[in-house]
Each structure stands twice: as structure tokens, then as C-alpha cells.
């Protein structure tokens, strides 16, 4: 059972630019099968495509490899403009931040966005805050009806870019002192 | 005319190894990819791998563990070895041939052997 | 893997009628379809590939087209010799993988 395909196994058509890195090739259709380690990139012009063989895929292609078969696959990541693979993105469309191979319209809880390059990048991790502090005022705990009292956190992980700021790592609030009068 | 035919016992008992032979003629199996596919009693179709013109084989998953296609170029032949078999391997099983993306896949199919899994 | 749905799995249709078979991918298979024609005690045999590209020697009444998930073939108008099984194959990515196959026979 065959069916009559023709198949030029010179690139008949190798004056074509299209044809270039052939191992087939037809004046219609362009390449349909490419040298070794070259990938088959299906390109397409309004109704028209055509096969071409390229060292490199275009942006929004990645390669695809299978043993001795190599094609450019389109990236169908969701707002992704280039792949480096089928669930990787390396470049994200306009207004979006890449994030471990993803595209996010804001970054995940613990990130921050780099504009400059817009990436997700690992925000600054602050820890817990500690016990408000005594009730003070003028360092003394004693002699006036109001004070402010303070609690704090540590960073627990400085932020991947310096221009990244810390979240405050102080906060203090009004108190009433326990003593409005000192003693003695 | 590239002409593909398939070779082999029909008859093989569980756990036993299926072996085919597909023989080719009209074309050189060091150019293009050599594949084995089968149909199941129900009419279902499973490709299950390819050897290329180079000898590199791809198989797929759920028979990677106990299936191999090998070839022998100077006959111009490729084999299918299927091991431990049971009677879920029973089906018509055919060699095909495609060239790459660009072109037809298996624009050329050999006509097919039933092989029966039973003891 | 990629799951191929084909539609209708049989039919029956008059000669001269105009007959369309569906196939959908579970993801977007980016054109990489084919479809083929299994007549009883023969092997399949390519009807189209990438879509809609006609194999040599196939008559004209065949038409493929699509994108993204869902492609189809359509045969314009049928004639006797079309009956058998029809079956679509994506190679967007390993494994291909065929469909159900849809029966179709003269009414």
C-alpha cells in the first residue's frame, strides 16, 4: 500500500532560498525534511506555509527534539513570548513578570517585581515580630500619662536586588503609661 | 514505488517475544524513519516507535520497558521485538514510513500481519 | 499524551452527499494533522497531511482544514468507493497518536 508521494531526495529547488539545509524540497511546499541538528520550522504566510530548516527557532518557537527529529514548536505558555522549552518561558509578552518559566500579571506572595527587567525576583523575607517593648517615653517608663512602646523583626533574607526595599522592620504605637508618677 | 512488508510468526504465547521483520524495497531505510504501528481487535491504532535513518530509536511510553526496533541496513530490513506478551498484544501489526515534519506521515504502510497472543 | 476525539465514531451517508468528520486534539496540535482511509483487509492509506495538503493521486472531493484543536475532513460529494474507516493522526508531539476512527458506510 503506497501512496504516490514524490519525494526529491536532492533539493530540486536549491536555488529557492527556503530550500537551504534541505534534504527535500518542493517549489509549493519548501522543505519537508531538514539536515541533521537543523530545525523544521513550518512557517506561515496568510493561507500559505511552507517548510524551512533553521539552526535556530524563531521568538515564540522553542525545539523540539526527538531522536534524529527536530521541529520549532510554537510556546503555549499563556502571555509567553519565547520558551526555552514546552512549560518554560525565558520572555513574557509586555506587562507581564516572568517567574520560574511563567508569566504573571503580578508576582506571587514573596516576590517582588524587577521592572527593569520584569522578573518575579525573590523579595526580602522579614521574620516574626517580637513583643511590643515597655511603655516609655524619653527612655523613662515613668512621669507622663502617654508613651510609645515598639516591637520589631529581623531580616531573616536580604532581597535578591538592593533596589528592592525591606518592608519596616520597626513599628511603635502610643501607650498609657503604668506609672504616671514616679516613685520617690 | 517504496514497497514495506511485514514478517513473523502469528501465533506467539504469553510471555514469550514477538519478533517482525519488515522488508523494504523502493527506498533505503538509511533515509526517513521506520516505524511500527499496530490495530487492535477493536479497530484501535498505537504507533509504538521508530527507528531513524541513523539508527536512533524513539519508543513510546507505556512500551518503552519491552519493546526495541533494530535494523539491518545491508538487507534493507528493520525488526519490531516485543517482549512478555499477553493476549492485550493481540492485534494486526504494520510498518510505516514518513520522511519528516514537512512531508506525509506514513505515506507508505506495509499490509499488515495479525498476530494472536494464546496458549 | 495527546488525546485525539473523533466524531462522529460511525455513519451513514448517500452517495453524492457531502460528509464531514471532526477531530479534536486535547491541546493545540499547531496543524500537524493527518487523516487516512482504511478500506477492510487493506492498510491505511494517506488522505492528507499538515491539515490540508492532498497526497498526490487522492481525489479532489477530499478536503482537510483546521487549527488550534479542531480540524476536520470533508468529502464533497460520496461516492461508493469512499466507504471505510477514516482516521486522524496528530505528530505535534510524541507519541502521535490516532483517533477512534469513524466508520462510514453507504446508506
Known amino acids: 500500500q503506497g501512496n504516490r508521494w514524490r519525494r526529491n531526495k536532492r533539493a530540486s529547488y536549491v536555488s529557492n532560498p527556503i530550500c537551504k539545509g534541505c534534504l527535500s524540497c518542493s517549489k509549493d511546499n519548501g522543505c519537508s525534511r531538514c539536515q541533521q541538528k537543523l530545525f523544521f520550522f513550518l512557517r506561515r504566510e496568510g493561507m500559505r506555509q511552507y517548510g524551512e530548516c533553521l539552526h535556530s527557532c524563531p521568538s515564540g518557537y522553542y525545539g523540539h527534539r526527538a531522536p534524529d527529529m527536530n521541529r520549532c514548536a510554537r510556546c503555549r505558555i499563556e502571555n509567553c513570548d519565547s520558551c526555552f522549552s514546552k512549560d518554560f518561558c525565558t520572555k513574557c509578552k509586555v506587562g507581564f513578570y516572568l517567574h520560574r518559566g511563567r508569566c504573571f500579571d503580578e508576582c506571587p506572595d514573596g516576590f517582588a517585581p524587577l521592572d527593569e527587567t520584569m522578573e518575579c525576583v525573590e523579595g526580602c523575607e522579614v521574620g516574626h515580630w517580637s513583643e511590643w517593648g515597655t511603655c516609655s517615653r524619653n527612655n523613662r517608663t515613668c512621669g507622663f500619662k502617654w508613651g510609645l512602646e515598639t516591637r520589631t523583626r529581623q531580616i531573616v533574607k536580604k532581597p535578591a536586588k538592593d533596589t528592592i526595599p525591606c518592608p519596616t522592620i520597626a513599628e511603635s504605637r502610643r501607650c498609657k503609661m503604668a506609672m504616671r508618677h514616679c516613685p520617690g | 514505488e517504496v514497497q514495506l512488508q511485514e514478517s513473523g510468526p502469528s501465533l506467539v504465547k504469553p510471555s514469550q517475544t514477538l519478533s517482525l521483520t519488515c522488508s523494504v524495497t523502493?527506498?533505503?531505510?538509511?533515509?526517513?524513519?521506520w516505524s511500527w504501528i499496530r490495530k487492535f481487535p477493536g479497530n484501535k491504532l498505537e504507533f509504538m516507535g521508530y527507528i531513524s535513518f541513523s539508527g536512533k530509536t524513539y519508543y513510546i511510553p507505556s512500551l518503552k520497558s519491552r519493546v526495541s526496533i533494530t535494523r539491518d541496513t545491508s538487507k534493507n530490513q528493520y525488526y519490531l521485538q516485543l517482549n512478555s506478551v499477553t493476549t492485550e498484544d493481540t492485534a494486526t501489526y504494520y510498518c510505516a514510513t514518513y520522511h519528516g515534519y514537512g512531508g506525509p506521515w506514513f505515506a507508505y504502510w506495509g499490509q499488515g500481519t495479525l498476530v494472536t497472543v494464546s496458549s | 499524551d495527546i488525546k485525539m476525539t473523533q466524531s462522529p465514531s460511525s455513519m451513514y451517508a448517500s452517495l453524492g452527499e457531502r460528509v464531514t468528520i471532526t477531530c479534536k486534539a486535547s491541546q493545540d496540535i499547531d496543524s500537524y494533522l493527518s487523516w487516512f482511509q482504511q478500506k477492510p483487509g487493506k492498510s491505511p492509506k494517506t488522505l492528507i497531511y499538515l491539515t490540508n495538503r492532498l497526497i498526490d493521486g487522492v481525489p479532489s472531493r477530499f478536503s482537510g482544514s483546521g487549527s488550534g484543536q479542531d480540524y476536520s475532513l470533508t468529502i464533497n460529494s460520496l461516492e461508493y468507493e469512499d466507504m471505510g474507516i477514516y482516521y486522524c493522526?496528530?505528530?505535534?508531539?510524541?507519541?502521535?497518536?490516532f483517533g477512534a476512527g469513524t466508520r462510514l458506510e453507504i446508506k
Open positions: 493522526l496528530q505528530y505535534d508531539e510524541f507519541p502521535v497518536t
Open positions: 523502493g527506498d533505503s531505510i538509511t533515509s526517513g524513519y
